[in-house]
Amino acid sequence: PEPPTACREKQYLINSQCCSLCQPGQKLVSDCTEFTETECLPCGESEFLDTWNRETHCHQHKYCDPNLGLRVQQKGTSETDTICTCEEGWHCTSEACESCVLHRSCSPGFGVKQIATGVSDTICEPCPVGFFSNVSSAFEKCHPWTSCETKDLVVQQAGTNKTDVVCGPQDRLRA
């Protein structure tokens, strides 16, 4: 018979034959042959593989480093990685939660809608027309543009979401 060019799901092609992949939680020890099945071994303590695979090494569980404010939210198994979270009152810097911050800041062009609490991070909002923020801050709201008119001045440079307007003297028409 012709050697296969493609294999079924949960199989892989090697040496012109289809071998079974190792199930999650196990790593490949040896490929199958004409006479033997794929040989797999369970991952060791603190290791995992989360897919049907032909990996010869299991992945190490993530370490939740207490020096970075991390603690274990969910202990890893042979099939799943450890999930880290931050100490109470601190917030993950990313979905992967590799480090912790007290709270995030709102970038220039954004103002703070809600200051962080122990359970929720800073909520930012874009500065609308007529308002600006030129700083990165965890507490400052968007500031309204300066009103040149109330100072008997005119707008020399328009404001943006990151900059205030620039006021200047009115042009005096000479008689």
């Epitope: 970075l68 404010g69 912790c100 709270h103 995030r104 965890a138």
Partner: nanobody, 116 residues
């Protein structure tokens, strides 16, 4: 290396005052927004007060408004928290924090105990 060293805590009677300091080193202090946070025994972190990098804007938690004053001296690379009319519920370890407020940049804190 960023270092924040808090000091000025101690035991004080209700109604008394304390002034906390936070000496900063390892970064250009001027221009950085700074915060005071506190952690009471067995409780979570509470954000107490903040001051903008320019010193022109401040924030106070409702629980300390009118009693605490935050300030900074950029020439001394130091942040301050003047605490007046202290109450038992102000008892906590007080920490200062700088943007981006990473856990590994926090100081060791200074303990404030308000008790008669």
């Amino acid at each position: 290396e960023v270092q924040l060293l808090e000091s000025g805590g101690g035991l004080v009677e209700p109604g008394g005052s304390l002034r906390l300091s936070c000496a900063a080193s390892g970064f250009t202090f001027a221009g950085y927004e700074m915060w005071w946070v506190r952690q009471a025994p067995g409780k979570g972190l509470e954000r107490v007060s903040a001051i903008s990098g320019s010193g022109g804007s401040t924030y106070y938690a409702d629980s300390v408004k009118g009693r605490f004053t935050i300030s900074r001296d950029d020439s001394k690379n130091t942040l301050y928290l003047q605490m007046n009319s202290l109450r038992a519920e102000d008892t906590a370890v007080y920490y200062c924090a700088k943007e981006p407020y990473s856990f590994d940049h926090r100081g060791q804190g200074t303990l404030v105990t308000v008790s008669s």
